[in-house]
Structures are given as structure tokens and as C-alpha cells.
């Protein structure tokens, strides 16, 4: 008799996932000399601790402090780009400004990107057919206490200015639900950090409004005056211009060298 | 260096046609988005179009002053920038610019410009 | 479009520190720069994205841009730095403010 197995709303672990990930820190490791010390079967023995033969919904982040400890990276504390529903343009950016730093690009969210994971209470296995989704099922489960454990270590870990590359073109501009906002915003320290600058994407060339006057970036403004940090905006009113320079750095009119 | 040296100034009565043109060196031409700038006598700097480079299919922009009457040009073979001015007005008198338009990810500047050609709309 | 506005005049003695302002709503929500231009010559770029300086610019130029003003800079004034400065920012187009005159006394 097959035993019964518990379905949730959510996609199932990414497929390949344990080959995923160890092929990734192997990656990431012979990339980044920093790194060559980690021993990547550590990490995925870690990783797969955090929440291997535990309740999807009942994970915490202590669950991922061996792996937290292993993934222990230094990135210089103020070229820390943050971003909040506009990741591929903000992993384009850093891949061509390469002193800036998303959290994708340090080694645990680079092991993380994109990929979803979650196993069964008392049972070795990882369930490849479906996981809770954070909305609909719960939101202790394995992916969103991840990321909210490693974002919560990013922004502790920002000074002086930080960036925050922010999606003009959707409704919430700064979503309070976010990743973003959740989390990141409320982990600035501010005894670090000095400014917070947003970057508000513009759609498209036509548009010449102040975005940073939009009702949710006011919102932003508060939350993070209130903490005692100051809080900068700056419309990017040419989304071609920041793709084709992202795209193309070596495109003589993107150089800001005079 | 980068060089850019304007002509085809000169005088012309109202409603009349001039062609400017600036002749580019110094630099690959075709890699950047160039500009014209315009400056009444005693008077400020005012933009007047610019003009995009290949890869943005030479896209198009006028300051409503001179929008449907002004065409901005450029031919990447000949390393030079044309405006072509229609229907002038007393009010376009001014040195034309030629302005390489310079930036970062971020943001746009003009980071060289020609010494100007004097346009006089008179009669 | 965003409007700039930039005093007419502006005086400062040798050695003095000068600062022209730039006064637009909200300019600190965009990416300003400064131009320099002596009379019968082009204008010249001293500061771009705010407070960047251009390779061959005096280090005593400096920009700074918050909230509703942009402010030019220039330390230990020179007679050479007599000119007419422009504010110039973007919003979808091109924006020159009114320009400054300052005079070295």
C-alpha cells in the first residue's frame, strides 16, 4: 500500500535538486578564491539538514544556522544592492558592476536562486511533487524561511549607502509584503547605515513622472526615517539605456570615464 | 581628441530653411547618442534634439519648441550630425550645439561639445 | 517637466568658498549636472550624476543634490572660475536651468 503523502499548494522540490546545488557551490567556490576554503559537501549535508525529516511547515531559521555558518562570506558592506521585484535586472547590473553585490551573488543565495526544496516529516525523502506554498499553506516552510534568514543576514550586514533597485512599472512600487519590505528594511542597522537611495525603474521612455513621489515610496521614506536612516530616490528614466549598458559595459556610451 | 565642429549658420528670414550640420572625429561616432543645444544671445542653454544611436534604431527627440518644424539626422559614414531647421522664427535665433551626450546605468550628460554655428532669423 | 531655477548672480572673493544653487520640486529625484562656460566658448561639463567629477576637473569643484536643491560648490575660488554655470537634468527630456553668473571679486 503506497503510503499516504501530504500534497500541497506549491511546485515540488526543483528536480536534480541535492546535484543542483552541489554543482553550484562547486561553481561558486572555484569562482570567488574567498571561498575555496568551503568544503561543499558540508554545505550540502547542511542544507539538506535544515530540512530533511522535518515538517515542511514547521521549519526555523535555527534549522539553517549550520548552514548559515559554513556559508559565512564577507562582501564589502557598503556596495550592497538590494532590489525588490526586478531581480533580473538587478543581477544584470551586478554582473557588469561587478564592486556591487545582490545577495545572489554571495555563495548562499547564489546556491538558492531560483530553486525550490522541502522533505516530509519523519522520512530521509525530499518531496518532488509538491511543497507549501507560503499564501496558501503556511509560511514556515523550507524556501521562505531560507530567504528570510539569509536576507535578514545581508541587510544586518549593509553600511554607509545602500541601494535598492525598485520596479517602477508595477503597482507597489515598495510592496510592505516583500522580501524587501518585510524583512530587509527592518534590518538596516542604523547605527551602519547612513543612506538608503532607491533606484525606481521607469517602464518605459515616455514616462516622466516622479515615481519617487508614488504613495509607496512615501511609505518606504517613513518606515525608514523612523529607524534613523536617510532615505534618497532617483528616478532611472531610461530603462533601454540601464539594459543596453547592462547588457554591453564595454558600449563606449555607457562608461561614466570622461 | 573628441572633436565636433559645427556649420551652416548664417542668416535667414522668417519662415525660411537652414541645414546644420557637425562633422565628428576622435571617436567612433556611431556608439553614441549626439544632441543639439541652443543658446539665444545673452540667454540660457536650451536642449533641442537628440538623436539615439543604432542599436536604439536612431530614435528621435524634440523640445516642443521646435517639435514637426526641426529634423534631427545623422549619417555614421560621414561621422556627421545634421539639423535640419523648416519654418524658422525670430525666436530660433541662437548658437547651435553639437553635444556628444556622455552617461552611466544612471544618467545622461553632455560631455563634449562644438564651439557652436550662430543662426540670425530675420528679416 | 521638472523646472530648474538658478539665482542670476552669484559673487565670491579669491579663495572664498562659492555655491550656486539649483531649485527645483523634488530635484533630489533626479540626476543633476553642471556646466561651466566662459563667454564666447562652449559650455563645459564640471559635474555629472549628481556629484561626479570629470577626469581633468579641479577638485574643488563639487555637487551635492536633496530634496528641492542642487548645489554647486567651489572651493578656494579662482578668477579662472569666473563663468556662467548651468544646472541640467533629465525627466524623460533634457532640462537646463536659467544659469548663474559668478563673479570673482
Known amino acids: 500500500v503506497p503510503r499516504w503523502r501530504q500534497q500541497w499548494s506549491g511546485p515540488g522540490t526543483t528536480k536534480r535538486f541535492p546535484e543542483t546545488v552541489l554543482a553550484r557551490c562547486v561553481k561558486y567556490t572555484e569562482i570567488h578564491p574567498e571561498m575555496r576554503h568551503v568544503d561543499c559537501q558540508s554545505v550540502w549535508d547542511a542544507f539538506k539538514g535544515a530540512f530533511i525529516s522535518k515538517h515542511p511547515c514547521n521549519i526555523t531559521e535555527e534549522d539553517y544556522q549550520p548552514l548559515m555558518k559554513l556559508g559565512t562570506q564577507t562582501v564589502p558592506c557598503n556596495k550592497i544592492l538590494l532590489w525588490s521585484r526586478i531581480k533580473d535586472l538587478a543581477h544584470q547590473f551586478t554582473q557588469v558592476q561587478r564592486d556591487m553585490f545582490t545577495l545572489e551573488d554571495t555563495l548562499l543565495g547564489y546556491l538558492a536562486d531560483d530553486l525550490t526544496w522541502c522533505g516530509e516529516f519523519n522520512t530521509s525523502k525530499i518531496n518532488y511533487q509538491s511543497c507549501p506554498d507560503w499564501r496558501k499553506d503556511c509560511s514556515n516552510n523550507p524556501v521562505s524561511v531560507f530567504w528570510k534568514t539569509v536576507s535578514r543576514r545581508f541587510a544586518e550586514a549593509a553600511c554607509d549607502v545602500v541601494h535598492v533597485m525598485l520596479n517602477g512599472s508595477r503597482s507597489k512600487i515598495f510592496d510592505k509584503n516583500s522580501t524587501f519590505g518585510s524583512v530587509e528594511v527592518h534590518n538596516l542597522q542604523p547605527e551602519k547605515v547612513q543612506t538608503l537611495e532607491a533606484w525606481v525603474i521607469h517602464g518605459g521612455r515616455e514616462d516622466s513622472r516622479d515615481l519617487c513621489q508614488d504613495p509607496t515610496i512615501k511609505e518606504l521614506e517613513s518606515i525608514i526615517s523612523k529607524r534613523n536612516i536617510q532615505f534618497s530616490c532617483k528616478n532611472i528614466y531610461r530603462p533601454d539605456k540601464f539594459l543596453q549598458c547592462v547588457k554591453n559595459p564595454e558600449d563606449s556610451s555607457c562608461t561614466s570615464e570622461i | 581628441q573628441v572633436q565636433l565642429v559645427e556649420s551652416g549658420g548664417g542668416l535667414v528670414q522668417p519662415g525660411g530653411s537652414l541645414r546644420l550640420s557637425c562633422a565628428a572625429s576622435?571617436?567612433?561616432?556611431?556608439?553614441?547618442?549626439m544632441n543639439w543645444v541652443r543658446q539665444a544671445p545673452g540667454k540660457g542653454l536650451e536642449w533641442v534634439s537628440h538623436?539615439?544611436?543604432?542599436?536604439?534604431?536612431?530614435?528621435?527627440e524634440y523640445a516642443a519648441s521646435v517639435k514637426g518644424r526641426f529634423t534631427i539626422s545623422r549619417d555614421n559614414s560621414k561621422n556627421t550630425l545634421y539639423l535640419q531647421m523648416n519654418s524658422l522664427r525670430a525666436e530660433d535665433t541662437a548658437v547651435y550645439y553639437c553635444?556628444?551626450?556622455?552617461?552611466?546605468?544612471?544618467?545622461?550628460?553632455?560631455?563634449?561639445w562644438g564651439q557652436g554655428t550662430l543662426v540670425t532669423v530675420s528679416s | 517637466d521638472i523646472e530648474l531655477t538658478q539665482p542670476p548672480s552669484v559673487s565670491v572673493a579669491p579663495g572664498q568658498t562659492a555655491r550656486i544653487s539649483c531649485s527645483g520640486d523634488?530635484?533630489?529625484?533626479?540626476?543633476v549636472s553642471w556646466y561651466q562656460q566662459k563667454p564666447g566658448q562652449a559650455p563645459v561639463l564640471v559635474i555629472y550624476?549628481?556629484?561626479n567629477r570629470p577626469s581633468g576637473i579641479p577638485e574643488r569643484f563639487s555637487g551635492s543634490n536633496s530634496g528641492n536643491t542642487a548645489t554647486l560648490t567651489i572651493s578656494g575660488t579662482q578668477a579662472e572660475d569666473e563663468a556662467d554655470y548651468y544646472c541640467?537634468?533629465?525627466?524623460?527630456?533634457?532640462?537646463f536651468g536659467g544659469g548663474t553668473k559668478l563673479t570673482v571679486l
Open positions: 553635444a556628444r551626450e556622455d552617461g552611466s546605468y544612471m544618467t545622461d550628460y553632455f560631455a563634449y
Open positions: 541640467q537634468s533629465y525627466n524623460g527630456t533634457y532640462v
Open positions: 550624476s549628481d556629484s
Open positions: 523634488n530635484i533630489g529625484h533626479y540626476y
Open positions: 538623436i539615439r544611436k543604432k542599436n536604439t534604431s536612431y530614435t528621435t
Open positions: 576622435g571617436f567612433t561616432f556611431s556608439s553614441y547618442a
